[in-house]
Interface confidence: low
Amino acid sequence: LRLLDHRALVCSQPGLNCTVKNSTCLDDSWIHPRNLTPSSPKDLQIQLHFAHTQQGDLFPVAHIEWTLQTDASILYLEGAELSVLQLNTNERLCVKFQFLSMLQHHRKRWRFSFSHFVVDPGQEYEVTVHHLPKPIPDGDPNHQSKNFLVPDCEHARMKVTTPCMSSGSLWDPNITVETLDTQHLRVDFTLWNESTHYQILLTSFPHMENHSCFEHMHHIPAPRPEEFHQRSNVTLTLRNLKGCCRHQVQIQPFFSSCLNDCLRHSATVSCPEMPDTPEPIPDYMPLWEPRSGSSDYKDDDDKGSSHHHHHH
C-alpha cells in the first residue's frame, strides 16, 4: 500500500482551509478523548480511478468520497482520518485531513474526496473514514467503512495499468487445445515479443471431479526474435488412464518484468460423455505464486512426454 507520488495532496475547498498529513492510524483523540465529538460520515463511496505518476506510469487508485451530516456536530469536526486496509495482508495505510479553520453550515452539503491510495489488481480493501476527534470509549462510533474489490488484470481498464502490464497482461496467447487421440493433446498458442521461456502445465481430471489424475510440466525454450508473435505448438503425451479425460492446460510465461510471477492463461478440454472415474489423488501446490484459477501441479510419477514446434 502506498500513496501516488506526484501531486501535492490537497483537501482545502472554498470555505475550508485544510491540509493532508501522513498518519500513524492512531489519532491522539484515542489517547486523549474529547467530550464533544462529531457525527459519522455519510454516503461513503469508493470507486476505481486511474492516475498517472510523474514518470508517466498508470496506476489504479481508490477514489474515496463522502459527505457530512447536516447536524450541529460539524462545529466540532476537526478533520478526518482515512484508512485503507489490504485484507489479505493486514497492511494498513492512513492519511489525515486536518482542518485549519472551523466548518460553517452552508447551502450545499459538505463533500470531501481523496484519490491517492494506490491499490493492487485483484485485491480487496477495507476503506474507513473516521471523523476527528474520535469518540470517547463508550460514545457512538463516528466512522464509516466499506469494502472495495479491485478488478484483476483481465479487466479492460486494468489491463493497461503499469502493474498489470508488468505482469504480462498485454500478452494474449489465444490458446487452442485439441485432443488428437486418447494419448495425445495438441496445444497451440501465440508467443509474446520477448525472448523468454514458457512452461506448459497440464492437469488432467476425471469427469466431474476436482482431484487430478495426471499432471505434466513441459518447458518451452525462449523463442528467437523472428519467432515473436508466431504460433507455437506442442504435442503432449497423456497417461493412459481410463476416465482421466478432462484436461486443463495452463501456460506460464517468464517475462523479464514479472519473472516467476507472470499472469498465466488457461484452456480446458472437456470429457466425452460418460467416462469412468479412477481414484482421486490429493492436490499439490507449486513454489511460485498461483495465478489464473487452478494452479496445483504435481505428479505421482511423471511419465508424460512432449515435443514442441514454433510456427512461422
Epitope: 510471477d261 507449486p286 505464486e289
Partner: antibody, heavy 118, light 107 residues
Framework: EVQLVESGGGLVQPGGSLRLSCAAS????????MNWVRQAPGKGLEWVSF????????YYADSVKGRFTISRDNAKNSLYLQMNSLRDEDTAVYYC???????????WGQGTTVTVSS | DIQMTQSPSSLSASVGDRVTITCRAS??????LAWYQQKPGKFPELLIY???TLQSGVPSRFSGSGSGTDFTLTISSLQPEDVATYYC?????????FGPGTKVDIK
C-alpha cells in the same frame, strides 16, 4: 550484486517476540516470492515460511503456524518474519532465501541467529 | 505431508571417488526437487534444480537424476572442496520440506 541481508536476531526469553528483517538488493524484489528457512545448532535445514511476490499466497510450516507471521514491503525491498510465543526449539540461524525461476532457492542471506533461552 | 528421506546420513570417500546420495519422497513430486550444498558455517548453495538441471556456476562433476519419488545426486569425482552436507528439497507444494542431509567427508 544480488544480495539478501538478514537482521533482527538476538537473545529472547521463552514466550517472547522478535521481528526479523531481510533487506534485498540487486534484483527486482517485487517480482519474486520469498522464503524463510532456519537451521537449529548442529541440525539440518527446516523451511519455515513462504510469501508470494504480491503477498497473495502465504504458507507456514506446522511448527510455526499461529506464532510466526511473514510479510513484505515491496516498496522497501524488505521481507519480515514476526515471531511470537517463542520456544526453546525456535533457537536457530534464520535465513531468507529467494526462489529461482524453475525451482529451488538460488539466493540466500548470511543468516541471523535467534537464541531462545531463559 | 510428504516426507523426504536421504541416504546415507554420512559417508567418507577418497578424492576422485564417485559419490552417490539418494533422496526419496514419500509421494510422487514429479521433478520438483532441488539439491543444496552447505559447507560448515556457511549458508546453503543451490546445486541442482528441477531434479537434474545444473545451477549456473556449479562444477559439472555434480549431476542429478530421478523423477517421481526417487532421486540421486552424483559427484563423479570427489574433490576436497566438496566436503559439506548435502540436502534435497521438494518444492511442488507447501510445506517445502528438506531432507535430513547427508554429510560427506574425505577418507
Amino acid at each position: 550484486e544480488v544480495q539478501l541481508v538478514e537482521s533482527g536476531g538476538g537473545l529472547v526469553q521463552p514466550g517472547g517476540s522478535l521481528r526479523l528483517s531481510c533487506a534485498a538488493s540487486g534484483f527486482t524484489f517485487s517480482s519474486y516470492s520469498m522464503n524463510w528457512v532456519r537451521q537449529a545448532p548442529g541440525k539440518g535445514l527446516e523451511w519455515v515460511s513462504f510469501i508470494s511476490a504480491r503477498s497473495s499466497t502465504i504458507y507456514y510450516a506446522d511448527s510455526v503456524k499461529g506464532r510466526f507471521t511473514i510479510s513484505r514491503d515491496n516498496a522497501k525491498n524488505s521481507l519480515y518474519l514476526q515471531m511470537n510465543s517463542l520456544r526453546d526449539e525456535d533457537t536457530a540461524v534464520y535465513y531468507c532465501a529467494r526462489p529461482k525461476v524453475g525451482g529451488g532457492m538460488d539466493v540466500w542471506g548470511q543468516g541471523t541467529t535467534v537464541t531462545v533461552s531463559s | 505431508d510428504i516426507q523426504m528421506t536421504q541416504s546415507p546420513s554420512s559417508l567418507s570417500a577418497s578424492v576422485g571417488d564417485r559419490v552417490t546420495i539418494t533422496c526419496r519422497a514419500s509421494q510422487g513430486i514429479s521433478n520438483y526437487l532441488a539439491w543444496y550444498q552447505q559447507k560448515p558455517g556457511k549458508f546453503p548453495e543451490l546445486l541442482i534444480y528441477a531434479a537434474s538441471t545444473l545451477q549456473s556456476g556449479v562444477p559439472s562433476r555434480f549431476s542429478g537424476s530421478g523423477s517421481g519419488t526417487d532421486f540421486t545426486l552424483t559427484i563423479s569425482s570427489l574433490q576436497p572442496e566438496d566436503v559439506a552436507t548435502y540436502y534435497c528439497q521438494k518444492y511442488n507444494r507447501a510445506p517445502f520440506t528438506f531432507g535430513p542431509g547427508t554429510k560427506v567427508d574425505i577418507k
